[in-house]
């Protein structure tokens, strides 16, 4: 029987019809249209773009397209009182000042409303003091400074290079170390690929380029003033002192020309080893303070940014399902950008636009998906995933009952080497099967499948002949859907060769130089990688919304659960004596994983055999698949992180961008040898094993025969 009862197009051609309708030329046009002026969250320009997208989605044929607005806390520089950093002499005179803006790229000299580089949500302040270089400001970097090098950051201004971890984690670590200010900079070692020219002649970061970004530690809270609830017209707002996740010390980003001026004077200790040295012609001394003749000079920060409650707008489009309208498959990506958003987010927004157009074309020809598809253009992602989180908070009861899947659609490219996918294990087989049907856009793989080029260029570390698929972390709009609500989620984009390009992200990330021309000239002139990403994202949405049986394989969850249990056990076994002393056992977890594996296997057998023409049984089996991800949610959340509720995955406590498996156990074990009360610490490990084992067992039971 057809998976597409609601169509008048030949069923087997539906997916093909959808994919064939996607055009690289359209994506290119949309990208151009979305990147001519800045679309900063909370600005009139971004509101106008929201209305334009609403109008175009209606034209494309969606059933309804609405704006959903919220009043959330945002952060902006003071237009008349710019932020900068100085070197001051013993008399307090400023003998060097960092630049106030990035030199605009060619063709954009007369564009107004380019926000100067700033760290969003930095408090105001003018701290002055000695500088300490803290490498990437990771947890291990501060351990190295404090425990090994005996360098105290208390009362110091720290300078950290961007990369490796989310900037908010860097600031949190600096605060915990007692720093009174943070300077973030882009080192050429991380943001300048060898052999490539800087923009506008290539895709590398020029010395005056600066990465903007928020420095919050929201842990999934959304709007800092309304955690857990939508920031609507009748919202009760916390006072700023009680706001979630705001930094307590001034923070400011700079480029590597300015960083050179600060770092070249550094004294104190030499760097501990080569991993602390970047590519500038400076010694990378750690400090504290400047060397020799400069030892009386200090660094002073001048930060005057303000936090303001501002209206933001999501665009929500609906394509009603013909058979199961109460089951939602969501495709969402953000619209707001720091400046032009050439890659982030508009390379993603342009792809979503073309996917909507293709679905709309099919709908105009009389087709409908089996399930409802929701399309979202999120606002204020750059300020902490605010638009998506507020909408999910407002609609949480519907989403937790009806949400089948969420596919994220931020930047379509961060390179042009191969595909990169992060998703729930439930989607592994969907991704594998889909990419086997798509053509590879890669040179040297003409006539080959995307699966083949992806597997060749990015092989799985565990399974030969399969591609690498990573864990979901955070730092993007899937967070609330996956980590808080337990809706199966995935993301896909084209990426760089991580083996040869060791820089973090892409060099021009969040700078003024992230333009349409950057993409059109250097990354994807033919827009073939954008088209491939559109096919992957769109194809996933199509299958999730249209297949009779949901394309989820619970057996893949069983495989990873065993792998994650083995991993966390081996971490714990680094402390064999303590495990013995405190009677720490992982037996319950391994037993639960074994049960899950057996029950998942039996469920998969039943899934092959059941009568798909019986709508009640079909719905029952699909509900078991849909609710499996939900079953991994602990309503109490993780310790001190109530909005991270997924027991199997959470953003790493040390890097929001990275996913951690069995995060409750992992965090309980982390640095356990330094805990003042070992008995209490190992008690918490035991509690977390109990929570994990119970959750896995409970999830397994949702797959058992219902009676």
């Amino acid at each position: 029987k057809s998976s597409n009862e609601a169509t008048n197009i030949t069923p087997k051609h539906n997916m093909k019809a959808f994919l064939d309708e996607l055009k690289a030329e359209n994506i290119k046009k949309f990208l151009y249209n979305f990147t001519q002026i800045p679309h900063l969250a909370g600005t009139e320009q971004n509101f106008q773009l929201a209305k334009q997208i609403q109008s175009q989605w209606k034209e494309f044929g969606l059933d309804s397209v609405e704006l959903a607005h919220y009043d959330v806390l945002l952060s902006y520089p003071n237009k008349t009182h710019p932020n900068y950093i100085s070197i001051i002499n013993e008399d307090g005179n400023e003998i060097f000042n960092t630049s106030l803006f990035e030199p605009p790229p060619p063709g954009y000299e007369n564009v107004s409303d380019i926000v100067p580089p700033f760290s969003a949500f930095s408090p105001q302040g003018m701290p002055e003091g000695d500088l300490v270089y803290v490498n990437y400001a990771r947890t291990e970097d501060f351990f190295k400074l404090e425990r090994d090098m005996k360098i105290n950051c208390s009362g110091k201004i720290v300078i950290a290079r961007y990369g490796k971890v989310f900037r908010g984690n860097k600031v949190k670590n600096a605060q915990l170390a007692g720093a009174k200010g943070v300077i973030l900079y882009s080192d050429p070692a991380d943001y300048f690929a060898p052999g490539v020219k800087s923009y506008p002649d290539g895709w590398n970061l020029p010395g005056g380029g600066v990465q903007r970004g928020n420095i919050l530690n929201l842990n999934g809270a959304g709007d800092p003033l309304t955690p857990g609830y939508p920031a609507n017209e009748y919202a009760y707002r916390r006072g700023i002192a009680e706001a979630v996740g705001l930094p307590s010390i001034p923070v400011h980003p700079i480029g590597y020309y300015d960083a050179q001026k600060l770092l070249e004077k550094m004294g104190g200790s030499a760097p501990p080893d080569s991993s602390w040295r970047g590519s500038l012609k400076v010694p990378y001394n750690v400090g504290p303070g400047f060397t020799g003749n400069f030892s009386t000079q200090k660094v002073k920060m001048h930060i005057h940014s303000t936090n303001e409650v501002t209206r933001i707008y999501n665009v929500i489009g609906t394509l009603r399902g013909a058979v199961e309208p109460d089951r939602y498959v969501i495709l969402g990506g953000h619209r707001d950008s720091w400046v032009f958003g050439g890659i982030d987010p508009q390379s993603g927004a342009a792809v979503v636009h073309e996917i909507v157009r293709s679905f709309g074309t099919l709908k105009k020809e009389g087709w409908r998906p089996r399930r409802t598809i929701l399309f979202a253009s999120w606002d204020a992602e750059e300020f902490g995933l605010l638009g998506s989180t507020e909408w999910a908070e407002e609609n949480s009861r519907l989403l937790q009952e009806r949400g089948v899947a969420y596919i994220n659609a931020d930047s379509s490219i961060e390179g042009n080497y191969t595909l990169r996918v992060d998703c729930t294990p439930l989607m592994y087989s969907l991704v594998h099967n889909l990419t086997k049907e798509l053509k590879s856009p890669d040179e040297g793989f003409e006539g080959k499948s995307l699966y083949e080029s992806w597997t060749k260029k990015s092989p799985s570390p565990e399974f030969s002949g399969m591609p690498r698929i990573s864990k979901l972390g955070s730092g993007n709009d899937f967070e609330v859907f996956f980590q808080r609500l337990g809706i199966a989620s995935g993301r896909a984009r084209y990426t760089k060769n991580w083996e040869t390009n060791k820089f973090s992200g892409y060099p021009l990330y969040h700078s003024v130089y992230e333009t349409y021309e950057l993409v059109e000239k250097f990354y994807d002139p033919m827009f073939k990688y954008h088209l491939t990403v559109a096919q992957v994202r769109g194809g996933m949405v199509f299958e999730l919304a249209n297949s009779i049986v949901l394309p989820f394989d619970c057996r893949d969850y069983a495989v990873v659960l065993r792998k994650y249990a083995d991993k966390i056990y081996s971490i714990s076994m680094k402390h064999p004596q303590e495990m013995k002393t405190y009677s720490v056992s992982f037996d319950s977890l391994f037993s639960a994983v074994k049960n899950f594996t057996e029950i998942a296997s039996k469920f998969s057998e039943r899934l092959q055999d059941f009568d798909k023409s019986n709508p009640i049984v079909l719905r029952m089996m699909n509900d078991q698949l849909m609710f499996l991800e939900r079953a991994f949610i602990d309503p109490l959340g993780l310790p001190d992180r109530p909005f991270y509720r997924h027991v199997i995955y959470a953003p790493s406590s040390h890097n929001k961008y990275a996913g951690e498996s069995f995060p409750g156990i992992y965090d309980a074990l982390f640095d356990i040898e330094s805990k003042v009360d070992p008995s209490k610490a190992w008690g918490e490990v035991k509690r977390q094993i109990y929570v994990a084992a119970f959750t896995v067992q409970a999830a397994a039971e949702t797959l058992s025969e219902v009676a």
Partner: antibody, heavy 115, light 107 residues
Framework: EVQLVQSGAEVKKPGASVKVSCKTS????????IHWVRQAPGQSLEWMGN????????TYNQKFQGRVTITVDKSTSTAYMELSSLRSEDTAVYYC????????WGQGTLVTVSS | DIVMTQSPDSLAVSLGERATLSCRAS??????VDWYQQKPDQSPKLLIY???TRHTGVPDRFTGSGSGTDFTLTISSLQAEDVAVYFC?????????FGAGTKVEIK
Amino acid sequence: EVQLVQSGAEVKKPGASVKVSCKTSGYTFTEYTIHWVRQAPGQSLEWMGNINPNNGGTTYNQKFQGRVTITVDKSTSTAYMELSSLRSEDTAVYYCAAGWNFDYWGQGTLVTVSS
Amino acid sequence: DIVMTQSPDSLAVSLGERATLSCRASQDVGTAVDWYQQKPDQSPKLLIYWASTRHTGVPDRFTGSGSGTDFTLTISSLQAEDVAVYFCRQYNSYPLTFGAGTKVEIK
């Protein structure tokens, strides 16, 4: 109690290589820099290089560049120093030390280079 | 390379008396200087780091001072167990370098 236990004395011919091990215990191995230092008979101390056990980042004394290789095995909390193309003037006691400030030292390994 | 020059080469001090050891760097090293004690046929031991901070368990008769290029290790009241060679080291720049040592004996 922090302990660094080095491998035993070695006698090598000129041109050969020597690999000295340093097994650590009593602290978190990845937390402290491991340095290698040598002391020729009746002489001062000479720093050879160091390693960050957490990520394998190394820095070498240019004097030994190309001849010295410092590695770690995290699974056994052991550091290694290999010196190649040995000559008679490499005869010395070789020490490993843990901590940026050489907080804890191994007992030393005498390497004799003689034809 | 930064050269660390220690003086005197050797020093004989009566028990209970003060011993003052000097270390001079060939260029400014801030306070990135350690002092070590090495007794005959033993490994060196860390005494002082960051020019003036005593390492855990080091008796308070040992005091370090100085910054820039001139550094001093003072033993306020020499004990018999303090007979050793004392080395300074700079860690302001690579390669990390040691002084030639000062031998302290009982007069």
